[in-house]
Interface confidence: medium
């Protein structure tokens, strides 16, 4: 047997040089780096490059899809609904998040080579858009709930209120992502690639717990409960009423909740297990650590994938988006005006009642 008998000068050094667990999307509790990573990771080189390919594909799809969504909404100024405004912000959030993916992809291969300033900025951008994206999904579900269940138009007709809600979401997202801006920096360690993670020095464990619980509650549990409540009652109303658009609305609503769950539930369940382990609620072992790290890597990809699926769910399923896109192409002479559908209207989110969209 080949013996790499590399004797360490001190027992602290003995633990140094272990690969760091990949830092996870929206996860604000860093790996235990203060004394050096103690477990041998079970990582395969192929995984690293597979993740980079996925990031690149999501980047391209998200860039294309969200740009088209924004383009169609911005072009349809006349009949723009409240949901359109939320979708515009959602597309912007997903687009901004997608713009950070090439940097994260590069860091998967080489470690964090971009310095502390970019570490803070890119991390902030990533977190802000994670929060705003999920919170906007919740707002869209509330808007549908008010429009279909309560047939409320007065509240959402007030454009300034919708703008205020959107600004509040961005503001709240910025607030929730503030710890990232304050604590995240490039950390250099002997024999280990530099990493971009939260360094809180000797701050209390309570701080760390708070920083882990925030994304799990605000980023998933609260929006999920809002969505389930709103879409549950919306579907019930659609079943009772005899609306012409009922089946299409149901299809889109089902797709929204299903894709949201498929993308975020696995990651958040693994994150919960990770939190329980890090807080010693369940005993941490190297084997469990490795299993959870691998699961975080895999489920993180699903979460990231959600940003490029939004245009497909919210827009491409709805025929109004296609009509809107065709209209833009016709305006620019890229297709014949004869090929436009007769009922093509500027708003792409579906049949609208005043300023409130009822379906996608």
């Amino acid at each position: 047997m080949e013996d790499f008998n590399m004797e360490s000068d001190s027992f602290e050094d003995f633990w140094k040089g272990e690969d760091l667990s990949n830092y996870s999307y929206s996860s604000t509790l860093p790996p235990f780096l203060l004394d050096a990573a103690p477990c041998e990771p079970e990582s395969l080189e192929i995984n690293k490059y597979f993740v980079v390919i996925i990031y690149a594909l999501v980047f391209l799809l998200s860039l294309l899809g969200n740009s088209l969504v924004m383009l169609v909404i911005l072009y349809s100024r006349v009949g723009r609904s409240v949901t359109d405004v939320y979708l515009l912000n959602l597309a912007l959030a997903d687009l901004l998040f997608a713009l950070t993916l090439p940097i994260w992809a590069a860091s998967k291969v080489n470690g964090w080579i971009f310095g502390t300033f970019l570490c803070k900025v890119v991390s902030l951008l990533k977190e802000v858009n994670f929060y705003s994206g999920i919170l906007l999904l919740a707002c869209i579900s509330v808007d549908r709930y008010l429009a279909i269940v309560h047939a409320t138009r007065t509240l959402t007709q007030k454009r300034y209120l919708v703008k205020f809600i959107c600004l509040s979401i961005w503001g709240l997202s910025l607030l929730l992502a503030l710890p990232v801006l304050l604590f995240r920096r490039t950390v250099y360690s002997s024999n280990v690639s530099p990493a971009c993670y939260e360094d809180m020095g000797n701050n209390t464990a309570n701080w760390r717990m708070l920083l882990r619980i925030l994304p799990q509650s605000f980023g998933f549990i609260v929006p999920l409960l809002i969505m389930l409540f709103c879409y549950g009652f919306t579907l019930r109303t659609l079943f009772k009423a005899h609306m012409g658009q009922k089946h299409r609305a149901m299809r889109v609503i089902f797709a929204v909740v299903l894709i949201f769950l498929l993308c975020w539930l696995p990651y958040n369940l693994v994150l919960l297990a990770d939190t329980l382990m890090r807080t010693q609620v369940i005993q941490e072992t190297c084997e469990r650590r490795n299993h959870i790290d691998r699961a975080l890597d895999a489920t993180e990809i699903l979460g990231i994938l959600h940003s490029c699926l939004n245009p497909l769910i919210y827009a491409f399923i709805g025929q109004k988006f296609r009509h809107g896109l065709l209209k833009i192409l016709a305006i620019h002479g890229l297709i014949s005006k004869d090929s436009l559908p007769k009922d093509s209207r500027p708003s792409f989110v579906g049949s609208s009642s005043g300023h409130t969209s009822t379906t996608l």
Epitope: S8, S10, F11, F14, P38, C39, E40, E42, C286, E287
Partner: antibody, heavy 122, light 106 residues
Framework: EVQLLESGGGLVQPGGSLRLSCAAS????????MSWVRQAPGRGLEWVSA????????YYADSMKGRFTISRDNSKDTLYLLMNSLRAEDTAVYYC???????????????WGQGTLVTVSS | SYELTQPPSVSVSPGQTANITCSGD??????ACWYQQKPGQSPVLVIY???KRPSGIPERFSGSKSGITATLTISGTQAMDEADFYC?????????FGGGTRLTVL
């Protein structure tokens, strides 16, 4: 179930050599740092040496440096301790143990073998 | 000489509470753990990371730490708890054990 089974102990003359083995099962061997701990008859526990999961890093107690060599074969899930220039004071039960080290400041032995007795006597 | 100091022996009546202490500079910034060793047997981990109890260890075993002193508490001590107890931590020179404490249940 985690199992650690030591072998290779026995009677050896002062100045002699001995190689202890520890066959591991029930866990992903290469994920764990492993260690040897010894206990002289009627005495307390004394840590001997540790080796990282990859094998690319070893550490020894001061009194063992230069005489003992820890190694591992991850393909065989086996840990080794080669002991040279043995002295009477090395007489002890040698335990193979799985070193849990899940936070920077906490390292402990979750699982122990049954031990193998090494007697150094002329 | 051991870098973690333990009393050589502690005696307790059945049903009473036994406290075994362990002191050392390394405990100021490192976790302590405790092992129970019965005659002719291998050590068994009873407390790790100062206060945590592995699965299978009775609830009567608990750990605490204040400054550089860690304490193993056995409440409602039973005859079967009679054994040697060792504390353990680590420092820049490696893993360190206490000298051990013989717990006698009277």
């Amino acid at each position: 179930e985690v199992q650690l089974l030591e072998s290779g102990g026995g009677l050896v003359q002062p100045g002699g050599s001995l190689r202890l083995s520890c066959a591991a099962s029930g866990f992903t061997f290469s994920s764990y740092a492993m260690s040897w701990v010894r206990q002289a008859p009627g005495r307390g526990l004394e840590w001997v040496s540790a080796i990282r999961g990859s094998g690319a890093g070893t550490y020894y107690a001061d009194s063992m440096k230069g005489r003992f060599t820890i190694s591992r074969d991850n393909s065989k899930d086996t840990l080794y301790l080669l002991m040279n220039s043995l002295r009477a004071e090395d007489t002890a039960v040698y335990y193979c143990s799985k070193l849990e080290a899940v936070s920077g400041t906490g390292k402990y032995f979750q699982h122990w073998g049954q031990g193998t007795l090494v007697t150094v006597s002329s | 000489s051991y870098e973690l100091t333990q009393p050589p022996s502690v005696s307790v009546s059945p049903g009473q509470t036994a406290n075994i202490t362990c002191s050392g500079d390394t405990l100021g910034d490192k976790f302590a753990c405790w092992y129970q060793q019965k005659p002719g047997q291998s050590p068994v981990l009873v407390i790790y990371q100062d206060t945590k109890r592995p699965s299978g260890i009775p609830e009567r075993f608990s750990g605490s730490k204040s400054g550089i002193t860690a304490t193993l508490t056995i409440s409602g001590t039973q005859a079967m708890d009679e054994a040697d107890f060792y504390c353990q931590a680590w420092n820049s020179r490696g893993v360190v054990f206490g000298g051990g404490t013989r717990l006698t249940v009277l």
